[in-house]
Interface confidence: medium
């Protein structure tokens, strides 16, 4: 007879994978505020993909396509994102991008459990947005429906690097613009993010189609059934986003509290015997004040667990409003 605890464990993940811990991981998911946020991500992505992909349609048809108007496409993508961020930022954080969501997970601004719902909503929104565009566009001009493709003279590796770079600059812009620790940020944060998207397009449309957003590439790929080099539009942006988020949050502008805990942990670790590990308790938010809020000044963040307003952090140590 074994002395196993009553709570069943899965695989080799030991004490982490108890039923209780799984439910704790999904704490805050089953609330009205959270589902509003997920729905907002879905709707924002649907509108963004529908509007922005519409600008890529070549009305010259298949016989003699019109020259690609890079400025038109770049502005449409940039302004669409800016508008959606302005509309939905206070509801869901206005990620509208799985790469941004992953970066938020890596910088502990949103839980993995919640990010799963966000990414699913974003992908579904992108598919439906691309689907609507396909339905309303004449077959004679549908073309590739804005499917992102690597330039014929470039390798997948080049494409991956370009996507990494442009997503890096986008996510760095997001983190820097929404940093509540800054007092020098003026003007529209949504526009700053939109311009960052536009700049990425102006540079990279000819290279890779300038995705910077895995869901934006996923939607038309599903509708058109074109999966050529699709993986780079997930791998590149996610790596770029995580690098940008990590560098900003932990290297360039780390939080005072984080620095204190890091030093604490580091000094304790040095005192430990070789080969042993220590457990650092962390049940607090990374920041003490509002973090990554869309509007400058005092802004209230929705507590998705209790469906009420409060400043700064919630019980699970996440900040939802983060673009």
């Amino acid at each position: 007879m074994s002395d196993r605890p009553t709570a069943r464990r899965w695989g080799k993940c030991g004490p982490l994978c108890t039923r209780e811990n799984i439910m704790v991981a999904f704490k805050g998911v089953w609330t009205q505020a959270f589902w509003k946020a997920v729905t907002a991500e879905f709707l924002a992505m649907l509108i963004f993909v529908l509007l922005s992909l519409g600008s890529t349609i070549n009305w010259g048809g298949t016989e003699k396509p019109l020259p690609v108007d890079m400025v038109l496409i770049s502005l449409c993508f940039g302004l669409s994102i800016a508008t959606m961020v302005q509309c939905f930022g206070h509801i869901s954080g206005g990620h509208i991008n799985p790469a941004v969501t992953v970066a938020m997970v890596c910088t502990r601004k949103i839980s993995i459990a919640k990010s799963v719902f966000y990414i699913a909503a974003q992908c579904l929104g992108a598919i439906i947005g691309a689907g609507i565009l396909y339905l309303v566009t004449p077959p004679s001009v549908v073309g590739g429906l804005g499917v992102t493709m690597v330039h014929g003279n470039l390798t997948a590796g080049h494409g991956l690097l370009v996507e990494l770079i442009i997503t890096f600059q986008l996510v760095f812009t997001i983190f820097a613009s929404c940093d509540s620790k800054r007092t020098d940020v003026t003007g529209s944060i949504a526009l700053a993010i939109g311009f960052s998207v536009a700049i990425g397009h102006l540079f990279a449309i000819n290279y890779t189609g300038a995705s910077m957003n895995p869901a934006r590439s996923f939607g038309p790929a599903v509708i058109m059934g074109n999966w050529e080099n699709h993986w780079i539009y997930w791998v590149g942006p996610i790596i770029g986003a995580v690098l940008a988020g990590g560098l900003y949050e932990y290297v360039f502008c780390p939080d005072v509290e984080f620095k204190r805990r890091f030093k604490e942990a580091f000094s304790k670790a040095a005192q430990q015997t070789k080969g042993s590990y220590m457990e650092v308790e962390d049940n607090r938010s990374q920041v003490e004040t509002d973090d990554l809020i869309l509007k400058p000044g005092v802004v209230h963040v929705i507590d998705v667990d209790r469906g009420e307003e409060k400043k700064g952090k919630d019980q699970s140590g996440e900040v939802l409003s983060s673009v």
């Epitope: 009305w59 048809g61 003699k64």
Partner: antibody
């Protein structure tokens, strides 16, 4: 008023090269959205598209005849020239040139061959 | 063998209505505008219908065009003896990157 007229030899020997000229008026082949194409019709048979040249010197050819065809334009002379190598008796046909306009580049474009020349009959025989 | 398929011949009495079909594939009719041409005996072809259903100036409204999916139809009402001609459908083919025509339909007015 747009007009086109084909000119060239009426009799060509097998293996020889056919050179046809289309002289047009009423439009310029430097205007965006405009093209000139060549179509042939063997006696008692259907129309067969051969080649097409656009205002920007972009050229398209029938896949089955691509290796034998060359289309060029002389904008200053308002002429389009089609050359067809290695002529064969099966190439006996009436050859037409036609004006093509694209709706996406021009408000009065039709995405069709809207004006045709009268045609020139070419016989390939030894 | 033409890329677009048309019936070889159709016939009807004067004053009657006749339709001529043209079928293709997703790369031609399915994704591009279709045009119809009329070729009177011994004459050059003339554009009859463009962009699926539009008539050039000078073409009477007895002639109409429609398109659905990968097939198209030319309709002629109030048939006249002067309508006796060969009718061709034509369109761009995205796969071939060129113009394609149907095999032609001979219209006989009885």
């Amino acid at each position: 008023q747009i007009t086109l007229k084909e000119s060239g030899p009426t009799l060509v020997k097998p293996t020889q090269t056919l050179t046809l000229t289309c002289t047009f008026s009423g439009f310029s082949l430097s205007t965006s959205g405009v093209g000139v194409g060549w179509i042939r019709q063997p006696p008692g048979k259907a129309l067969e598209w051969l080649a097409l040249i656009y205002w920007d010197d972009d050229k398209r050819y029938s896949p089955s005849l691509k290796s034998r065809l060359t289309i060029t334009k002389d904008t200053s002379k308002n002429q389009v020239v089609l050359t067809m190598t290695n002529m064969d008796p099966v190439d006996t046909a009436t050859y037409y040139c036609a004006h093509r306009s694209l709706s996406s580049y021009s408000s009065n474009g039709k995405d069709a061959f809207d004006i045709w020349g009268q045609g020139t009959m070419v016989t390939v025989s030894s | 063998q033409s890329v677009l398929t048309q019936p070889p011949s159709v016939s009807a009495a004067p004053g009657q209505k006749v339709t001529i079909s043209c079928s293709g594939s997703s790369s031609n009719i399915g994704s591009n505008y279709l045009s119809w041409y009329q070729q009177l005996p011994g004459k050059a072809p003339k554009l009859l219908i463009y962009e699926n259903n539009k008539r050039p100036s000078g073409i009477p409204d007895r002639f109409s065009g429609s398109k659905s999916g990968t097939s198209a139809t030319l309709g002629i009402t109030g048939l006249q003896t002067g309508d006796e001609a060969d009718y061709y459908c034509g369109t761009w083919d995205s796969s071939l990157s060129g113009v394609v025509f149907g095999g032609g339909t001979k219209l006989t007015v009885l």
